[in-house]
């Protein structure tokens, strides 16, 4: 079997939902010593970057300016060390937002409910679209989809305090082209009196995967690695 290097990690810096005409940044984290990184879009080569010096950095950032629907879709990356290529990374879906119109989000029976009540969100957009998306802030990967001509409903069932938070919806023109976001609707769920103080609230920090953790190798790291290698040999 043909030998390959471990697959790299692909991430979107800050968010995978990019407003049209803004810049997207995709990070491909591979390995120190990689001489070339390739970004692929919908199966075709999109861009190439050759880090300098290759042994000092474990990945690259690909900048995609002027986001539009032609650049929205599935991205992956690979890297090369010498003549040996890595496996392909997982796929990353890059979405363009702020296309066309703004939907309206409402919640029934209302934004303030008691734990155990059934809640339904309604997303309405009068322009031609059939797919609607509901996202909870801080949980942008947990996208709920629903379908309807001008309005879609998102039944949440009996809610708990875990459902607390701010929600937005989008109309979708295809999987990768979304409308402007709706105004946020904040859902407040009150629990039993004795549980209310213990109920967790959503973290306000952004999604943890929306960060590029590329590192430069320092002289100190190199010395430590060499020392560790020497120590291992001495132990043997």
């Amino acid at each position: 079997p043909k030998q390959t290097l471990p697959k790299p990690i692909i991430r979107a810096e800050s968010t995978y939902m990019v407003p049209k005409e803004k810049q997207a940044t995709l990070c491909c984290q591979g390995s120190y010593g990689a001489v070339e990184y390739q970004l692929h879009f919908e199966g075709s080569l999109f861009a190439v970057e050759r880090p300098k010096p290759p042994e000092r950095i474990n990945g690259v950032k690909f900048h995609i300016p002027d986001m539009n629907s032609r650049k929205a879709g599935r991205y992956s990356c690979i890297y090369r060390v010498g003549e040996l290529w890595s496996e392909r990374s997982d796929l990353l879906d890059l979405v363009v937002t702020e296309m066309y119109d703004t939907p309206t989000l409402s919640v029934h029976p209302g934004p303030e409910v008691t734990s155990g009540e059934k809640v339904t969100f309604y997303c309405r957009l009068d322009t031609a679209t059939s797919m609607f998306l509901l996202l909870k802030e801080g949980r942008s990967r947990d996208v709920q989809r629903s379908y309807g001509k001008v309005q879609a409903e998102f039944p949440m069932g009996p809610v708990t305090t875990a459902h607390r938070g701010s929600y937005r919806c989008f109309g979708s023109y295809n999987n990768y082209a979304w409308s402007f976001p709706s105004e946020p609707v904040k859902l407040l769920v009150t629990g039993d009196i004795e549980n209310t103080s213990l109920a967790p609230t959503d973290p306000t920090f952004p999604d943890s995967w929306d960060t590029c953790l590329l590192t430069r190798e320092t002289g100190l790291q190199k010395d430590l690695a060499l020392w560790d290698h020497t120590a291992q040999n001495l132990l043997r």
């Epitope: 970004l39 879009f41 999109f46 300016p65």
Partner: nanobody
Framework: EVQLVESGGGEVQPGGSLRLSCAAS????????MGWFRQAPGKEREFVAA???????YYAESVKGRFTISRDNAKNTVYLQMSSLRAEDTAVYYC????????????????????WGQGTLVTVKP
């Protein structure tokens, strides 16, 4: 707004050479990644060659070893030196730019490019 104007096209015999130029207006040229694409009659537009801000280059397999892309930031111009030309190189050649870029990527996919020239015709025939 960036404007790109290609020149240098013409008719040449197989085995001959041509140098295409692409002059860019605007002060953003040094921060632009540049590329050349071509479109033969009745065919899709295809990638030819590209150059990053830091002069890294990438070529289509069909032109590797025959074509050379280069840039002169002082003149706001990118060049495509074409040698050992073949009949299948006949096409309209387009210059394109990705503006702005912040890294040193070489862009290969046509969707990456946000500015395009009008094209210059290259005809290779005996």
């Amino acid at each position: 707004e960036v404007q790109l104007v290609e020149s240098g096209g013409g008719e040449v015999q197989p085995g001959g050479s041509l140098r295409l130029s692409c002059a860019a207006s605007g002060r953003t040229f040094a921060s632009a990644a540049m590329g050349w694409f071509r479109q033969a009659p009745g065919k899709e537009r295809e990638f030819v060659a590209a150059i990053s801000r830091s002069d890294d280059t990438y070529y289509a397999e069909s032109v590797k070893g025959r074509f050379t892309i280069s840039r002169d930031n002082a003149k706001n111009t990118v060049y495509l030196q074409m040698s050992s030309l073949r009949a299948e190189d006949t096409a309209v050649y387009y210059c394109a730019a990705v503006v702005p870029t912040y890294g040193n990527a070489i862009y290969v996919h046509s969707a990456a490019y946000n500015y395009w020239g009008q094209g210059t015709l290259v005809t290779v025939k005996p």
